[in-house]
């Protein structure tokens, strides 16, 4: 048994990493492996995380992980049975990869303008709940071609459009997902999408 | 909302013990390590150890080794710290405080004063 | 006796920019990642900047830090009267840190 990808955490910079990687062929992750960390500290203890199949030769772990802060760095130990497959390292502050928004929802009550708001993923205390940014995207469920992205650049998890911006009398999809600059991570995954049907009235032509 | 709440000012005698508690709330215990440090009269702050509420394991500063002990209660979620063979010199303010960076809060500190 | 020296004592008029430095070695500040602490009058210490230059969420952006080597420096903008408080850098001490450390403190006095 051989570790064919090399296990690649990323971090939530909350209370999870999770840790992917490939094996040379099909293997029982939960019952053939077992991936053990150590927070490299003081009085630290260490933990098994028993990976999950994420197809055929994938594994997954989801690491519990406390009190993240930037010096943090785990030594990571892949075990099947007694033989130690692979000896790594992880760093979670260069490695983050913010949770994904929730509770989004469109308001179609303000005078001609849609108002999406969400949720910050994380609670004020977390460094991240100030650093968030967002990607918001629109699409019609009639037209694959009327896609669009909204910037999100301030710290309010919300934004506004005039709905006259979107096709009138038809359905639209909405989903947001955020990044932070501050500890260059990737983008989270999207938040679950939401529908809402848009309309307004149309201005009067003048003649 | 994070509390840290401190048992109450003792007036100790030269060569006593005294044992300080901290209970914690609005957070989960045994995910933050406790510090305790501690302020003299008009002096700075300084650290004493900390403890690590998940197996109870703790790492003292060398000055105080020998002499400190620090303990948790996972069921109420308190933290100790003893201190014994007091002299004048340990008259402070006792703070203890979570997480591996001293987050806030912190508690209020509880005052020892030792006095013949 | 700490090994992270500060200055005793700073002082500035309101609105006026403030820097405390805290000198160390490359067992401490330059192996390590430095907070700084505001102790108002009479009352416990308060987390201001950790990691060299985040702020916990409540401390206004008046409030920074850097590092740089083997010291570090938190500077403070716009002085209030509400800022004249003592100042304490800490980090953790020894490879592997062992030991937390603060540094001798400094008082702060707005004029």
């Known amino acids: 048994m051989k570790v064919l990808q090399e296990p690649t955490c990323v971090s939530d910079y909350m209370s999870i990493s999770t840790c992917e990687w490939k094996m040379n062929g099909p293997t029982n992750c939960s019952t053939e492996l077992r991936l053990l960390y150590q927070l490299v500290f003081l009085l630290s203890e260490a933990h098994t995380c028993i990976p999950e199949n994420n197809g055929g030769a994938g594994c997954v772990c989801h690491l519990l992980m406390d009190d993240v802060v930037s010096a943090d760095n785990y030594t990571l130990d892949l075990w099947a049975g007694q033989q130690l497959l692979w000896k790594g390292s992880f760093k979670p502050s260069e490695h983050v990869k913010p949770r994904a928004p929730g509770n989004l929802t469109v308001h179609t009550n303000v005078s001609d303008t849609l108002l999406l708001t969400w949720s910050n993923p994380y609670p004020p205390d977390n460094y991240l709940y100030n650093h968030l940014t967002y990607a918001v995207n629109i699409w019609s469920e009639n037209d694959p071609a009327d896609f669009r992205i909204y910037n999100v650049t301030y710290l309010e998890p919300s934004l506004r459009i005039a709905a006259s911006t979107l096709k009138s009398g038809i359905s639209y999809r909405a989903r947001v997902r955020a990044w932070a600059q501050c500890y260059n991570t990737t983008w989270s995954e999207w938040s679950p999408s939401t529908k809402w049907h848009n309309s307004y009235r149309e201005p009067f032509e003048q003649h | 909302q994070v509390q840290l709440v401190q048992s109450g000012a003792e007036v100790k005698k030269p060569g006593a013990s005294v044992k300080v508690s901290c209970k914690a709330s609005?957070?989960?215990?045994?995910?933050?390590?406790m510090h305790w440090a501690r302020q003299a009269p008009g002096q700075g702050l300084e650290w004493m150890g900390i403890i690590n509420p998940s197996g109870g394991s703790t790492s003292y500063a060398q000055k105080f080794q020998g002499r400190v002990t620090m303990t948790r209660d996972t069921s109420t979620s308190t933290v100790y710290m003893e201190l014994s063979s007091l002299r004048s010199e340990d008259t402070a303010v006792y703070y203890c405080a979570r997480g591996k960076l001293l987050k806030n809060p912190w508690g209020k500190g509880t005052l020892v004063t030792v006095s013949s | 006796q700490s090994v992270l020296t500060q200055p005793p004592s700073v002082s500035a008029a309101p609105g006026q920019k403030v820097t405390i430095s805290c000198s160390g070695g490359s067992s401490n500040i330059g192996n390590s990642y430095v907070s700084w602490y505001q102790q108002l009058p009479g009352t416990a210490p308060k987390l201001l900047i950790y990691?060299?230059?985040k702020r916990p969420s409540g401390i206004p952006d008046r409030f920074s830090g850097s590092k740089s080597g083997t010291s570090a420096t938190l500077a403070i903008t716009g002085l209030q009267t509400g800022d004249e408080a003592d100042y304490y850098c800490g980090t953790w001490f020894g490879t592997p840190a062992s030991n937390y450390v603060f540094g001798t403190g400094t008082k702060l006095t707005v004029l």
């Open positions: 609005g957070y989960a215990f045994t995910s933050y390590y």
């Open positions: 990691d060299n230059n």
